[in-house]
């Protein structure tokens, strides 16, 4: 969409933006829109919040269609009420080592983040906090009865998706890569980011990838077999094309998605990979974006909670698709 045509806005009045989100004109100076926030997808028509010093980072010039809202170089981070300088590392709790980079925080778990799947000898595994220990440990006792309304829809649990070995040293560079952040949507296309110095200059950089934990249209509960409470990785009947801001993937994909549970458990990506996807836009332009592809999902009781400063911030926007 270029800005040379006459301005016409949606028929409904200007949107009401959530608290702290600016109402701004789109990139064409035409219509009032809620500004996109740090880490969200942005376009010429959907600009980033200028009052927070954000800009739309389109990556390579060839991809000037869809970008990610990024803080200007050197922007500090506010995390848990504390301001950190860009480049500063800190321990958010005994569980996570974090780094601030240009307004974004990336964290690496210091505890094991494995997923334990149910087994005959341990049908209901769950993690518990033991006195005097920082990291949670798996226990196998029976779950408490939980009253749950509707399926649990967590978008992401810290998955078994690791970058280079954090202790890896290469040419005087301690290579460190944080975990991919939560997908910004519980359903539909979102984005996930991480911080790494795994590059030629050993310089910290932000990376982003598209992600889709599950399609929004799918009524996954219907597919749960009688007597079962979960559908871990629902079968997608036909290959699909991904859509991104009016552009469509050039190939079709038989992608895997995570399902839902009706008993309070969350089904989230367990193992993932990142692959490039080419999107073709209505004007013929082609752009390439990295995207998360799910290999396996896991359903577990270790759902996002507010007991940990990092986890609560990390997971909070999983609910209600505010991103």
């Amino acid at each position: 969409q270029n800005c040379s045509g006459p301005c016409r806005c949606p028929d409904e009045p200007a949107p009401r933006c959530p608290a702290g989100v600016s109402l701004v004109l789109d990139g064409c100076g035409c219509c009032r829109v809620c500004a996109k926030q740090l880490g969200e997808l942005c376009t010429e028509r959907d600009p980033c919040d200028p009052h927070k010093g954000l800009f739309c980072d389109f990556g390579s010039p060839a991809n000037r269609k869809i970008g990610v809202c990024t803080a200007k170089d050197g922007a500090p981070c506010i995390f848990g009420g504390t301001v950190y300088r860009s480049g500063e590392s800190f321990q958010s709790s005994c569980k996570y080592q974090c780094t601030c980079l240009d307004g974004a925080v990336g964290c690496m778990p210091l505890c094991s983040m494995d997923v334990r799947l149910p087994s005959p000898d341990c049908p209901f595994p769950r993690r518990v906090k033991l006195p005097g220990k920082c990291c949670e440990e798996w226990v196998c006792d029976e779950p408490k009865d939980q009253t749950v309304v509707g399926p649990a829809l967590a978008a992401y649990r810290l998955e078994d998706t690791f970058g280079p070995d954090p202790t890896m040293i290469r040419a005087n560079c301690l290579v460190q890569t944080t975990e991919w952040s939560a997908c910004s949507k519980t359903c539909g296309m979102g984005i996930s980011t991480r911080v790494t110095n795994d590059n030629a200059s050993c310089r910290l950089e932000k990376q982003s990838r598209l992600c889709m934990v599950r399609p929004c249209e799918a009524d996954l509960e219907e597919n749960i077999k009688k007597g079962k409470k979960c559908i871990r990785t629902p079968k997608i009947s036909k290959p699909i094309k991904f859509e991104l801001s009016g552009c469509t993937s050039m190939k079709t994909y038989r992608a895997k998605f995570c399902g839902v549970c009706t008993d309070g458990r969350c089904c989230t990506p367990h193992r993932t990979t990142t692959l490039p996807v080419e999107f073709k836009c209505p004007d013929g332009e082609v752009m390439k974006k990295n995207m998360m592809f799910i290999k396996t999902c896991a359903c577990h009781y270790n759902c996002p909670g507010d007991n940990d400063i990092f986890e609560s911030l990390y997971y909070r926007k999983m609910y209600g698709d505010m991103a």
């Epitope: 969409q1 045509g5 301005c7 016409r8 806005c9 028929d11 409904e12 004109l25 100076g29």
Partner: antibody, heavy 119, light 111 residues
Framework: EVQLVESGGGLVQPGGSLRLSCAAS????????MAWVRQAPGKGLEWVAN????????DLLASLKSRFTISRDNAKNSVYLQMNSLRAEDTAVYYC????????????WGAGTTVTVSS | VVMTQTPLSLPVSLGDQASISCRSS???????????LEWYLQKPGQSPQLLIY???NRDSGVPDRFSGSGSGTDFTLKISRVEAEDLGVYYC?????????FGQGTKLEIK
């Protein structure tokens, strides 16, 4: 009552300048685009310019861009048309109109102000 | 985009149906998918007033004897039963491409 009242028209010599004003009342001015449309004597309507909510984007008829400027002052609920290097063919009734920026264009019109360019 | 109206003059009797045609020199679909084709009436000695927007939507307060239709490049305004207050010059207008343009006008007059 929603109202637009134009002023500033008159007789001006070729090459001269005029600044037309349009005072709006009865609606939230900053929630609307505004526009100028003109009508030469005995002729049809011709769109001249429009301006977005806050004045950061203006669009003008290409042939008038070098001589005409549209602006607005939301604090005064007013929109303006600055006309420079006027020519005889600019003689017309100039209407101020409210542009919804959404479904329809000009849903409210002023009564118009007459500009005559003559020596 | 040139907007061509026919006829330029339309003599009618009160109570008759009137039909005005407007043809655009190219498609007037905006890049957002909407067609911004509008009809205005300018009564003698008055400012224009909006009748129809987006091809077929009546503005508030416009009697239902006015209807708009069409697509692509051909559009029509119909008045089912002409009343005395309907007399004046009717203009079609396109707002999908720059420059925004009006048709040359159709004068609806009493036979």
């Amino acid at each position: 009552e929603v109202q637009l009242v134009e002023s500033g028209g008159g007789l001006v010599q070729p090459g001269g300048s005029l600044r037309l004003s349009c005072a709006a009342s009865g609606f939230t001015f900053s929630d609307y685009y505004m526009a100028w449309v003109r009508q030469a004597p005995g002729k049809g309507l011709e769109w001249v310019a429009n301006i977005n909510y806050e004045g950061s984007r203006t669009d003008l008829l290409a042939s008038l861009k070098s001589r005409f400027t549209i602006s607005r002052d939301n604090a005064k609920n007013s929109v303006y048309l600055q006309m420079n290097s006027l020519r005889a063919e600019d003689t017309a009734v100039y209407y101020c109109a409210r542009d919804t920026s959404r479904g329809s264009y000009f849903d409210v019109w002023g009564a118009g102000t007459t500009v005559t360019v003559s020596s | 985009v040139v907007m061509t109206q026919t006829p330029l003059s339309l003599p009618v009797s009160l109570g008759d149906q009137a039909s005005i045609s407007c043809r655009s020199s190219q498609s007037i679909v905006h890049y957002n998918g909407n067609t911004y084709l509008e009809w205005y009436l300018q009564k003698p000695g008055q400012s224009p007033q909006l009748l129809i927007y987006k091809v077929s939507n009546r503005d508030s307060g416009v009697p239902d004897r006015f209807s708009g239709s069409g697509s692509g490049t051909d559009f029509t305004l119909k008045i089912s039963r002409v009343e005395a207050e309907d007399l004046g010059v009717y203009y079609c207008f396109q707002g999908s491409h720059f420059p925004l343009t009006f048709g040359q006008g159709t004068k609806l007059e009493i036979k």
